[in-house]
Interface confidence: low
């Protein structure tokens, strides 16, 4: 379980000057995203960043360059993956108030002026404050409304239908809001109808089972329309539940399921004392037997650069459920010894999605991985290759002498993905070789001298250059450089007959 | 056989952006030994560089042209994209797109931009 | 930025002709010089790499020379297919930069 992320400023509320800049930071043990008050489109002068740091946290910066009324809000930030449609946000906030002496109130979307109460709850008139001090009153028709304000939310308490307008005073300015309107929803004469599939995937020899459930209403006809109908394949049964409120729960059950039972199935339910219909469908697939497909959002040969955070991301559409698993070099994948982690989460009732991450890329991460999905009925894998890009490094720089000829070889060993270049440069005045001019580059047509390059593997390249004599003590170059950096290392190359009365001194 | 696409619109208006997109096929934008470049040709002028992309998004541009020039890259479509703003007459030539690794092996056949008002 | 100055700017050759086109550079930029053809209305193609190396299907006439700053593509026995604009490219140093062309024409 992931802590909460962190804010800083570390407060739960903040008022921020008037067309100031604010920055706000969000740390997190995993991707961290914001939501804040704007919409997309008014959110121009919004900007967030992902920044880097040392701490092993992932740090997302929200950035407003010129802060204005409408920046009054809950700005809340929440890991990535916890986010679901239905849920409240799971996160941090912070609540940021922009004063403005001409803008009272936060401006508000046309929806937010009609406030719906259900029965006798209670409801929120959403007029809030850009300045968490400003003095607030709430008025009907009929005058002041006792009702508790908070300016993050605005009025809470239980209102009667019709027009409320808030007002505030401003530096003895007086500012109202055009009205908010309230209105109730009852429990309607339309029928309210409900259909429930746990399931809408199945295989042969199954037991699809589908239910209807009607609310409020004890005089109803509701008729079953399904593939297998008109053989009388379906058993259907009625169950009424009357605690906490009337309740008639119609279930259709079709067992020994096969293929030609795939199709939509409907329940239309007819109020018996009014002409009122309602219909509901469901689309059931029953295979003939369990499958896998899987589908990555990725090709089969991966590139990532040293020390880059990435994810691989598949998906996976099976029946029955399975079991998913990862490979390293046909390995299985043991997270804890590695920066790499793999997730599984279901995404609607086939599909699934899993997740390879690379925390910090290593060079020893590149290799051939493979995910495997399966279960009773089938077996899938997708293998992919992924390469971690690294700068050019030269290995080693060695020379080679040829005996009595005179001649030398001098080989020059780099790694580096993609695969680096070799370039060889000489400088003949020993003396001078501090001086960046004194070298020049080696030709290829250069009679007596020849030069070759070979690669060893995917990511090691080997490069020759053979002088037939050397007649003074020289110095090599060799330079190793791809797309993503470059190094250079030097050797001397003294002379056979040098190196002789070397040895004899 | 690696094929290269250019598409956009021919006539562009002085002062607006400029887009043109490359699509690749016979081929993955995503291979790691290669980079995606922009390279342009006034009428009856010499090539300049415009720009190039990796597939992870890393970015190179001419510095004549890097205030005005976005490229980004759409490896689930398997194509990549050149943006050139506030344009003017002297941005009228024929725009390639490119493969190359050092070298610009394979060109697509050119698409022509004229800004005119 | 690496200015890379073609000479001639223009040759009138007649048929099975060699041809010389040098590339001269601004700077040493070792061996990662390339020549490109283009014929009208068509883009160019690499035809040498790193100065002499001729890219896969490229005819054995066409040959690449040279290193440091000076660079030469020669075309031995010319054809008449060979009519063309002749571009040399640099890619050591960003931005990377092309010669200003050199056009060949056929008798």
């Known amino acids: 379980q992931l802590s909460l992320p962190s804010i800083l400023p570390n407060e739960n509320e903040k008022v921020v000057q008037l067309n100031s800049s604010f920055s706000l930071r969000c740390f997190g043990e995993s991707e961290v995203s914001w939501q804040y008050p704007m919409s997309e489109e008014e959110s121009s002068d919004v900007e967030i960043r992902n920044e880097e740091n040392n701490s092993g946290l992932f740090v997302t910066v929200l950035e407003v360059s010129s802060a204005s009324a409408a920046h009054t809000g809950l700005y809340t930030c929440y890991y990535n993956h916890t986010q679901t449609e239905e849920n409240e946000l799971e996160g941090r906030h912070i609540y940021i108030y922009v004063p403005d002496p001409d803008v009272a109130f936060v401006p508000l979307g046309m929806t937010d002026y009609l406030v719906i109460v259900e029965d006798d709850d209670s409801a929120i008139i959403p007029c809030r404050t850009t300045d968490p001090e400003t003095p607030v009153t709430l008025h009907n028709s009929e005058g002041v409304v006792p009702a508790s304000y908070d300016s993050r939310q605005g009025f809470n308490g239980t209102f009667t239908v019709g027009p409320y307008i808030c007002e505030a005073t401003v530096k003895g300015k007086k500012f109202q809001t055009i009205p908010f309107n309230v209105y109730a929803l009852k429990a309607t004469s339309e029928l309210d109808l409900e259909m429930e599939a746990l399931k809408t995937v199945y295989k042969s020899g199954e037991t699809i089972v589908v239910t209807c459930a009607v609310f409020n209403n004890e005089v109803v006809d509701l008729q079953w329309t399904y593939p297998g109908e008109v053989k009388g394949k379906g058993i259907t049964m009625l169950e009424e539940i009357k605690v906490p409120s009337i309740k008639l729960v119609y279930t259709l059950t079709v067992p020994e399921a096969t293929v030609k039972d795939s199709g939509d199935y409907e329940c239309a339910a007819r109020q018996a004392t009014r002409e009122v219909k309602e219909m509901k469908k469901v689309t059931i697939s029953v295979h003939e037997k369990g499958f896998i497909e899987i589908k990555p959002t990725f090709s089969q040969l991966e590139a990532v650069n040293l020390h880059e955070v990435k994810h691989f991301v598949v998906e996976v559409r099976a029946y029955p459920p399975p079991r998913i698993s990862w490979l390293k070099n046909n390995l299985t994948l043991i997270e804890n010894l590695t920066e790499i982690t793999t997730d599984v989460e279901k995404i609607q009732e086939i599909r699934y999605r899993s997740k390879l991450k690379l925390i910090r890329a290593k060079e020893e991460d590149s290799g051939h991985y493979t995910i495997v999905a399966q279960n009773e009925d089938a077996v899938k894998s997708y293998t992919f290759e992924l390469l971690t890009q690294v700068p050019s490094s030269i290995l080693d720089l060695v020379d080679d002498h040829h005996g009595s000829t005179g001649g030398q070889t001098v080989r020059c060993t780099a790694e580096g993905t993609p695969l680096p270049d070799i370039e060889w440069m000489i400088c003949k005045d020993i003396k001078k070789c501090n001086n960046e001019t004194s070298w020049t580059i080696l030709a290829n047509n250069v009679s007596n001298i020849i030069t070759e390059i070979h690669s060893r593997d995917r990511s090691t390249v080997e490069g020759r250059v053979t002088f037939a004599k050397v007649e003074e003590t020289i110095a090599v170059r060799c330079l190793a450089k791809n797309l993503l950096g470059a190094e250079n290392r030097e050797l001397k190359l003294v002379a056979p007959t040098l190196r002789s009365e070397l040895t004899v001194a | 056989q690696l094929q290269l696409q250019e598409s956009g619109p021919g006539l562009v208006k002085p002062s607006e952006t400029l887009s043109l997109t490359c699509t690749v096929s016979?081929?993955?934008?995503?291979?790691?030994?290669?980079?995606w470049g922009w390279i342009r040709q006034p009428p009856g002028k010499g090539l300049e560089w415009i720009g190039t992309?990796?597939?992870?998004?890393?970015?190179y541009y001419n510095p004549s042209l890097k205030s005005r020039v976005t490229i980004s890259v759409d490896t689930s479509k398997n194509q990549f994209s050149l943006k050139l703003s506030s344009v003017t007459a002297a941005d009228t030539a024929v725009y390639y797109c490119?493969?190359?690794?050092?070298?610009?092996?394979?060109w697509g056949q050119g698409t022509l931009v004229t800004v005119s008002s | 930025e690496i200015v890379l100055t073609q000479s001639p700017d223009f040759l009138s050759v007649t048929p099975k002709e060699k041809v010389t086109i040098t590339c001269r550079a601004s700077?040493?930029?070792?061996?990662?010089l390339h020549w490109y053809q283009q014929k009208p209305d068509q883009s160019p193609k690499l035809l040498i790499k790193?100065?002499?190396q001729s890219f896969s299907g490229v005819p054995s006439r066409f040959s690449g020379s040279g290193s440091g700053t000076d660079f030469t593509l020669t075309l031995n026995s010319l054809e008449a297919e060979d009519a063309a604009t002749y571009y040399c490219?640099?890619?050591?140093?960003?931005?990377?930069?092309f010669g200003q062309g050199t056009k060949v024409e056929i008798k």
């Open positions: 490219h640099q890619s050591t140093i960003l931005p990377w930069t």
């Open positions: 490119a493969r190359h690794h050092w070298v610009f092996d394979y």
């Open positions: 992309i990796y597939y992870t998004g890393s970015t």
């Open positions: 700077q040493i930029i070792g061996s990662s």
């Open positions: 790193y100065a002499s």
């Open positions: 016979g081929g993955s934008i995503s291979s790691s030994n290669y980079y």
